[in-house]
Interface confidence: low
C-alpha cells in the first residue's frame, strides 16, 4: 500500500536568464528511494539520480542543469522556452512509483520571484 505523498514547489516563476530550484520531497512513507527521474514538459529526461550510482545529467541539458540540492535540480540560464511542466518521479521500494508536478513560468519582468513554498499536488 502506498502511504507516501510528494510535496513539490508547486507553481513557481523565475526571471529569464536567472536560475531556479526544482524540488520534490517524499514524506509519510518509510519506503527506500532507489531512483529519482526529472522530466521536462515534452517528456524529455533532464536528469536521473540513482541512489547507488549517483547523478546523470542528460547531454542536451549538461550546460544548464546542475544536480541538487539534495534530490532536487537547479535550472540555470533560463529561457522563455523553459516555461512549462516538470515532473519528478520517485522510484521507491517497496511502495512503487510516486510522481510530482511543478509548473515553471519564466518571466521577462524583473518582478518575477521564485517561490520556495512546498505544495502537495
Amino acid at each position: 500500500m502506498m502511504t507516501g505523498t510528494i510535496e513539490t514547489t508547486g507553481n513557481i516563476s523565475a526571471k529569464k536568464g536567472g536560475s531556479v530550484i526544482l524540488q520534490c520531497h517524499l514524506s509519510s512513507t518509510m519506503a527506500q528511494v532507489t531512483q529519482v527521474n526529472w522530466e521536462q514538459h515534452d517528456h524529455s529526461l533532464l536528469a536521473i539520480r540513482n541512489a547507488e550510482l549517483g547523478w546523470h545529467i542528460y547531454p542536451a541539458f549538461k550546460d544548464r542543469v546542475a544536480p541538487g540540492p539534495g534530490l532536487g535540480l537547479t535550472l540555470q540560464s533560463l529561457t522563455m522556452n523553459d516555461t512549462g511542466e516538470y515532473f519528478c518521479t520517485y522510484h521507491t521500494y517497496p511502495d512503487g512509483t510516486y510522481r510530482g508536478r511543478i509548473f515553471l513560468e519564466v518571466l521577462e519582468s524583473s518582478v518575477a520571484e521564485h517561490s520556495a513554498r512546498f505544495q502537495i499536488p
Partner: antibody
Framework: EVQLVESGGGLVQPGGSLRLSCAAS????????VPWVRKAPGKGLEWVGY????????YYADEVKGRFTISADDSKNSLYLQMNSLKTEDTAVYYC??????????????WGQGTLVTVSS | RIVMTQTPLSLSVTPGQPASISCQAS??????LAWYLDKPGQPPQLLIS???KLASGVPDRFSGSGSGTDFTLKISRVEAEDVGVYYC????????????FGGGTKVEIK
C-alpha cells in the same frame, strides 16, 4: 537508417562457448540501453541482460548469471554477448534491441533480425 | 524478481470485432509497461510504451491503459494482420530484474 544487426550464432555442443555480436547503425550506441532478449522454440520472449548505458553496470537474468557476459565497444558501435558453459535450454533466437529512451520508458523500439543459437550434442 | 502474468493465453477473434488482453505485474511497475506484437519470422514490434503511448507507425486501433500493477491492451477492430503473439513487458527500477516479459497471448482470426 536506424538498425541493429546480430551475428555469431550457430551450432555448439553443451558446455561450449559462443560470442554474439550486435552492430548498431544510425544512432549513437552509447546513449541507449541495448538489452539482449531471446526466444526459445515454443517459448516466449525472455530478457537475457544488458549494460546500463548511463551508469555502466551489467545486469543479467538469473538463468544466465555467471555464464554470460555482456560488453560494449562504443568506438565500433557494437555490443557483445559472450556465452560460456552453454546448456541445451539456451537454444533460442537471440535479439539485441534498442531501449529508445532509457530512464523514461524502458521500451524496445528497434530490434535486430535475431541470430539462432543451437546447443546440441 | 518481478513476474508478469498475461491473460488469456489465446484469443480467437472475428475480424472487425474488439479484443482485449490483460497483464498483471507482481509489483507496482507503473509507468514502465510496454506491449509488443511478435509475428513468425519477424522480430517483435513495439506497439505501446509507458502503458498508453502509441509507438510510431502503429495503427490507432491499438490502445493501452492501466497503472500500478494492472494493464490492458485493446484492439478496437481486429484485422487479419493483427495475428501473432502479444507480450507485455515491464521494467522494475528498484532491483536488477531488468526487462520482464509476460508469457504471451496468441491472437488468431476466426
Amino acid at each position: 537508417e536506424v538498425q541493429l544487426v546480430e551475428s555469431g550464432g550457430g551450432l555448439v555442443q553443451p558446455g561450449g562457448s559462443l560470442r554474439l555480436s550486435c552492430a548498431a547503425s544510425g544512432f549513437d550506441f552509447s546513449s541507449y540501453g541495448v538489452p539482449w532478449v531471446r526466444k526459445a522454440p515454443g517459448k516466449g520472449l525472455e530478457w537475457v541482460g544488458y549494460i546500463d548505458p548511463i551508469f555502466g553496470p551489467t545486469y543479467y537474468a538469473d538463468e544466465v548469471k555467471g555464464r554470460f557476459t555482456i560488453s560494449a565497444d562504443d568506438s565500433k558501435n557494437s555490443l557483445y554477448l559472450q556465452m560460456n558453459s552453454l546448456k541445451t535450454e539456451d537454444t533460442a533466437v537471440y535479439y539485441c534491441a534498442r531501449d529508445y529512451s532509457y530512464g523514461y520508458a524502458y521500451a524496445l523500439d528497434i530490434w535486430g533480425q535475431g541470430t539462432l543459437v543451437t546447443v546440441s550434442s | 524478481r518481478i513476474v508478469m502474468t498475461q491473460t488469456p493465453l489465446s484469443l480467437s477473434v472475428t475480424p472487425g470485432q474488439p479484443a482485449s488482453i490483460s497483464c498483471q505485474a507482481s509489483q507496482r511497475i507503473s509507468p514502465y509497461l510496454a506491449w509488443y506484437l511478435d509475428k513468425p519470422g519477424q522480430p517483435p514490434q513495439l506497439l505501446i510504451s509507458r502503458a498508453s503511448k502509441l509507438a510510431s507507425g502503429v495503427p490507432d486501433r491499438f490502445s493501452g491503459s492501466g497503472s500500478g500493477t494492472d494493464f490492458t491492451l485493446k484492439i478496437s477492430r481486429v484485422e487479419a494482420e493483427d495475428v501473432g503473439v502479444y507480450y507485455c513487458q515491464s521494467y522494475y527500477v528498484h532491483t536488477s530484474s531488468g526487462y520482464a516479459f509476460g508469457g504471451g497471448t496468441k491472437v488468431e482470426i476466426k
